[in-house]
């Protein structure tokens, strides 16, 4: 009979985590909207976190937000200001592996 251990090992065997596309650097204008895309795939579905200049991104109502997408995650910044300049990094993990990608917003 199939045991839970065997099911677990089958899951482990099929697990993967891939960065499908590196994040692009973005140069944009004051007041515009910028979108950064974290394109990853994996099994089990990865958890994705966003960092700015090495610190967790602070979401701001109606201005800065991130959400899950079919390809991973999207970070959107509206009404851009010069203070938004910096390194943005997405970090994805499926519990076993970690992948990350970094882009510069100017």
């Amino acid at each position: 009979p199939t045991s839970s251990w065997n099911i677990s090992s089958e899951l482990n065997k099929d697990s993967y985590l891939t960065l499908d596309e590196p994040m692009n650097n973005i140069t944009t204008s004051l007041g515009q909207t910028a979108e950064l895309h974290c394109k990853v795939s994996g099994n089990p579905p990865p958890t994705i976190r966003w960092f700015k200049n090495d610190a967790p991104v602070v979401q701001e109502p109606r201005r800065l937000s991130f959400r899950s997408t079919i390809y991973g995650s999207r970070l959107r910044i509206r009404n851009l200001d010069t203070t938004d300049t910096g390194y943005f990094q997405c970090v994805a993990t499926n519990g076993k592996e970690v992948v990350s990608s970094t882009g510069v917003l100017f």
Epitope: N53, D54, A55, P56, V57, T83, Y87, V104
Partner: antibody, heavy 120, light 107 residues
Amino acid sequence: EVQLVESGGGLVQPGGSLRLSCAASGFTFSSYFIHWVRQAPGKGLEWVALIYPDTDDTYYADSVKGRFTISADTSKNTAYLQMNSLRAEDTAVYYCARYGYLGVGAFDYWGQGTLVTVSS
Amino acid sequence: DIQMTQSPSSLSASVGDRVTITCRASQSVSSAVAWYQQKPGKAPKLLIYSASSLYSGVPSRFSGSRSGTDFTLTISSLQPEDFATYYCQQLYWTPGTFGQGTKVEIK
């Protein structure tokens, strides 16, 4: 070993110009923000300007905007600060610093500083 | 620009004392705060980054903490070589603004 070495400081008259250099070694120069920070005699640290050498994007403090220009030569691993229309209040030690992203979110390496004196 | 209000501006302490310096950010800067030590005639040296991470080679008597927009640098047992000026800096927003500095003097 990561190193930043500034040069080009000196005595200049008000209204004059000076160009500071920051020679970098020991790391991938184009991948890091390079900043200039200054410190007037007996005062605190004041951020001046930054450049991302890979794209030549720049940003300035309001106090120097329109007078100072930051640039970089990736073939020489060197950043520059061109200072025009200098004023007495620009008198300071000028430091270049590397922003050490991804693991160390701070200015992890600094140069030794170069003194700029604006006086008649 | 974001303001980093540092206090006290100076303090007198003795070797072995526990010393605490605080910085308050004018708005959220996440955990992107660093602390530097500067001695006369020298460039600043990084002590703490990401609010509480000890930089390589820095003695463990230095520590950092965060509570919302308040950040603290603590020296658990002051040593003779620790008499210097300390600065906080936020790095979340560009430009990376500094606090006014705290001079730690010998009592």
